[in-house]
């Protein structure tokens, strides 16, 4: 959301969320690291071109035009600096002067040595336990947000993992028209169009970045879960790694598991959609899982096929019109799952990235509060993993995204919420080994054993 | 100026347990990230692990995990390393030091002058 | 875990000589590598830290160097304050090793 110096009635005001990086003449004298030549305090540019017409409610959203709601200046970075005051460098460099590039390899988590599975499990449950050092989130939309009194800003402090289930619930919530009116569901920053792998991707990159920072460990990377195994189990669920089910009660982790201690955030939808609230930093129920267990619908009790990425991997065009989830012959909805994985829509068939969540059968297959299930990450860098393989192969072809008439938050250029400092989807529309300094050592059915690079 | 002062040299019995303590100045210890090192006799450095005081975390190397165990109090600008279960294989001087991770600089800047341990019946 | 290897373990030059220490990583360190001189009985000291910048205070005639897995330190024009142990460290991922040290004695 925003960074904690933006979170105050002043800045709120001007509009203008410029930290300093370094003030060693008081506040104010270092805007985006401006004196050391860092970047500078401009104007944001944020996509103005139409959407499509599912969304009839322009100006009742705060998520709008991205984030001019909020801030109409932020920091620009020069060269490889970036951050929200140009005090860290772009993903893939570091160094004082952040020229110096690195690589990072996302690995089957089922591949990692004892301690490397036991080292990523407590690095996720720091994360689920550390105050994010540089954000905080709203508890108000934007007319409520200086509070009762107009004098006292609603934000919190959040977890970094919480955060990354904050940003989530945050672009998948309804509209509030206002009280005593329904709120309007048919919106979504961040699935159902274009802009699903660029969002999802971004999201996982600054998990994995915070936690870096978290552990002082560069090398840090988010595992893989291969879902695509055609099986009715879950091998990741076993208390090394995810955890294994409760004896007591089938729809919990193991108590041998530390996830089992975990409580979930954005649980109360009904609250926020009567009241016009945000989902808070508050803590509520524990994760449900119950992984093949949804005996009324027998088509979401077996994971993806290894096949079905592969036909997916077919698919050649980015996406179509109507840039939606009945799109047809678009990789997008193929790997999203709401097409078969040939590519064909069909209304009644949920694949791949979709059927994984929702053979979870539990939190992790309810879109506003999926991520609180840390299968969530691994599951969803699988999904960018086949992504990167589609970037690669078809030589990162973004002239079938739209420049507009997508759904909204999901043009080519549109600021994909709520991350910030502001990014478009077109920023993670690229490899990831040449652009973004991580890549996948992943084996596609029918290939050799890579290092995607 | 920025010092580390650690506390002073223990004998204790094997099977017994240490705390050590290294206070801090010229420095909010809530910005930086506290290391210690295990040097023993004649020998090399060995990473042990760190501590964030700000908010408590810790990683230590796996070798140390379970013996090792790192605390600070933020009020007096100091830090703890306690250790358990100790053998004469623990006979070493600790070093406490920090690492500034503002811009990922790679180094443990300020050390401690070291706190001998005597592991012995 | 990254390994460090050092070499060598020990060396023994004259006053303004020059001497190199090398380090190599199991893997791939991106430069994240810093090198400490121990005086005997002393802490150790910084000398170069991201692989190749000098720390405040620390004489131009050391420099550091590499990249990748390979890393080396260079003293040139030995002084008698030189002599010590030197130790590289890398900070890429946990846990953050040590080489195991260089006796370099001034003969």
């Known amino acids: 959301q925003f960074p904690r110096e933006c979170a105050n009635i002043e800045a709120l005001r001007r509009g203008v969320c410029c930290p300093d990086l370094l003030p060693s003449s008081g506040p104010g004298t270092d805007p985006c690291g401006s004196s050391s030549g860092r970047g500078r305090c401009v104007a944001v540019i944020a996509d103005s071109r139409p959407h499509s017409r599912h969304y009839p409610h322009d100006g009742k959203d705060d998520r709008e035009a991205w984030p001019l709601r909020f801030f109409n200046r932020t920091c620009q970075c020069n060269d490889n600096f970036s951050g929200h005051n140009c005090g860290t460098c772009r993903p893939g460099w570091r160094g004082a002067a952040c020229n110096q590039k690195i690589l990072t390899v996302r690995r089957n988590l089922l591949d990692l040595s004892p301690e490397e599975k036991s080292h990523f499990v407590r690095a996720l449950d720091m994360a689920k336990r550390t105050t994010h050092p540089q954000f905080v989130i709203a508890t108000r939309r934007l007319e409520d947000i200086l509070g009762p009194d107009g004098n006292t800003p609603q934000f919190e402090n959040i977890s970094v993992y919480n955060y990354f289930v904050w940003t989530h619930y945050y672009s998948v919530k309804k509209t509030f028209l206002g009280t005593g009116q329904e709120s309007f569901g048919d919106v979504d920053f961040s699935h159902e169009g274009p802009a699903f792998l660029t969002w999802h991707r971004y999201h996982l990159l600054q998990l994995e970045r915070d936690m870096q920072e978290m552990l002082q460990e560069p090398s840090f990377s988010l595992p893989y879960w291969n879902f695509a195994t055609g099986k009715n189990v879950c091998d990741v669920c076993t208390d090394d790694l995810m955890g294994s089910r409760s004896n007591f009660d089938s729809t919990l982790i193991s108590p041998n598991s530390v996830f089992s201690q975990w409580r979930v955030v954005c649980e109360s939808l009904e609250e926020y959609d009567t009241l016009g609230t945000l989902c808070n930093s508050t803590e509520g129920g524990p994760i449900r899982r119950n992984p093949a267990g949804n005996v009324g619908r027998p088509a979401v009790q077996r994971l993806p096929e290894p096949q079905d990425v592969t036909q997916c991997l077919e698919v050649r065009v980015f996406d179509t019109p109507p840039f939606y989830s009945n799109s047809t012959d678009s990789f997008r909805n193929t790997v999203e799952g709401y097409s078969a994985p040939t590519g064909k829509y069909d209304p009644a068939v949920r694949s791949l990235h979709n059927l994984a969540h929702l053979f979870l059968n539990g939190t992790g297959g309810q879109t506003h509060l999926s991520p609180n299930d840390p299968i969530f990450v691994l599951l969803h860098t699988f999904t960018d993993a086949v992504f990167d393989e589609w970037l690669r192969r078809y030589n990162a072809d973004i002239s079938t995204f739209p420049l507009e008439n997508a759904p909204i938050g999901h043009n080519r250029q549109y600021n994909m919420v709520p991350f910030w400092p502001p990014v478009t989807n077109t920023e993670m529309f690229v490899t990831a080994p040449d652009n973004l300094g991580y890549a996948y050592e992943v084996q596609w059915p029918g290939q050799e054993f890579t290092v995607s690079e | 100026e920025v010092q580390l002062q650690q506390s002073g040299a223990e004998l204790v019995r094997p099977g017994a347990l240490v705390k050590l303590s290294c206070k801090t100045s010229g420095f909010n210890i809530k910005d930086y990230f506290l290391h210690w090192v295990r040097q023993r006799p004649d020998q090399g450095l060995e990473w042990i692990g760190w501590?964030?005081?700000?908010?408590?975390?810790?990683v230590y190397d796996p070798k140390f995990q379970g013996t090792a165990s790192l605390t600070a109090d933020t009020s007096s600008n100091t830090v703890y390393l306690q250790l358990s279960g100790l053998t004469s294989e623990d006979t070493a001087v600790y070093f406490c030091t920090r690492r500034d991770y503002t811009y990922e600089k790679a180094a443990l800047d300020y050390w401690g002058q070291g706190a001998s341990v005597i592991v012995s019946s | 875990d990254i390994q460090m290897s050092q070499s060598p373990a020990s060396l023994s030059a004259s006053v303004g000589e020059t001497v190199t220490i090398t380090c190599r990583a199991s893997g791939n360190i991106y430069n994240y590598l810093a090198w400490y001189q121990q005086k005997q009985g002393k802490s150790p000291h910084l000398l170069v830290y991201d692989a190749k910048t000098l720390a405040d205070g620390v004489p131009s005639r050391f420099s550091g160097s590499g990249s990748g897995t390979q890393y080396s330190l260079k003293i040139s024009s030995l002084q008698t304050e030189d002599s010590g142990n030197y130790y590289c460290q890398h900070f890429w991922s946990l846990p953050f090793t040590f080489g195991s040290g260089t006796k370099l004695e001034i003969k």
């Open positions: 501590i964030n005081p700000d908010n408590g975390n810790t």
